[in-house]
Interface confidence: low
Amino acid sequence: NSCELTNITIAIEKEECRFCISINTTWCAGYCYTRDLVYKDPARPKIQKTCTFKELVYETVRVPGCAHHADSLYTYPVATQCHCGKCDSDSTDCTVRGLGPSYCSFGEMKE
Amino acid sequence: APDVQDCPECTLQENPFFSQPGAPILQCMGCCFSRAYPTPLRSKKTMLVQKNVTSESTCCVAKSYNRVTVMGGFKVENHTACHCSTCYYHKS
């Protein structure tokens, strides 16, 4: 496996101001070893591992305001440890493809 | 950047448990790319239950297979082609 912490840029949207700020953070990316069982035993747990967080912390950033909107605080998750493990569907949207970490609904991106 | 060379590609390999001399059972195994990151606001808005993290993943699965019966009467899949595609058993 080669699932590891990777530097990424995430976009944090300030919806009421129609802009995003970009933040450099760490998240998980890489390759995980999986196999497709030849004998499908209903009683046997089937586990496919994905590159996801093992430990995470939350960081808070001040997002600047605009015209009639004050600055606000935005809290986002940061991975501190990665592994090839089950996707925790309670906290995670387990999908084939999402919008990507730096998706911004608006044209303007502030550094 | 994560290195593909650290992990063997998703391919057919012999399954030692169900294979017999002259009658190999092949199984898809190997690595596929996945990543996780904070869920963008746009995605959160479409969720009934908001999830803070998005995990994009594909798994090494059989694209095609033949069903065969092996010793002991077990019905198994003899995989004939593999690909990195939708993971079905990766959620807890």
Epitope: T9, N24 | C31, C32, T58, A81, C84
Partner: antibody, heavy 122, light 107 residues
Framework: EVQLQQSGAELVRPGTSVKISCKAS????????LGWVKQRPGHGLEWIGD????????NYNEKFKGKATLTADTSSSTAYMQLSSLTSEDSAVYFC???????????????WGQGTLVTVSA | DIVMTQATSSLSASLGDRVTISCSAS??????LNWYQQKPDGTVKLLIY???SLHSGVPSRFSGSGSGTDYSLTISNLEPEDIATYYC?????????FGGGTKLEIK
Amino acid sequence: EVQLQQSGAELVRPGTSVKISCKASGYTFTNYWLGWVKQRPGHGLEWIGDIYPGGGYTNYNEKFKGKATLTADTSSSTAYMQLSSLTSEDSAVYFCARTPLYGSSYGGFAYWGQGTLVTVSA
Amino acid sequence: DIVMTQATSSLSASLGDRVTISCSASQGISNYLNWYQQKPDGTVKLLIYYTSSLHSGVPSRFSGSGSGTDYSLTISNLEPEDIATYYCQQYSKLPWTFGGGTKLEIK
């Protein structure tokens, strides 16, 4: 050796459609995303969208939604792009290109086809 | 969309020269940048991926560097076969976008 062989040049009338192909060889077709890129003189390279033949998943550049339709035939390891309601703006060279990471749309394009020239003219 | 700018559209250099081609992004792209070479016959090849990693089969005279919004491709000892147009491309955020290209010519 990875190869992407594209179909030949097309001369088409405005308002019609054209379907160009990209035949892949030298790798497992279903394991890699295949993208399409447009090149017009003076306009550089533009990413149109991509397709994952292993599941039929597609992703489009907003600019090309409704213009381009991406499909793949896994039995012949061939990807297709159909362009509809053609205008002179669609006259360009179109490339198919494969991603470097198996199972991932990430990472740009490691291998490129030779390009297909589409000319839209009355 | 992230706008990729290659300020120099054409560049003239002599054989054996060290040539640097630059590319800037309209926002930080976390090193998610590739460099491509397009020969006069239209053939496109990946040279450098993830800012500085050399793609297999690419001569070691090609190198890449940069961070944040500013990136560059360097050819340390210009050879006749390096005559081509060079494009940068970001894969940090969809849609993937390319620079306008820098055409390299021999003096």
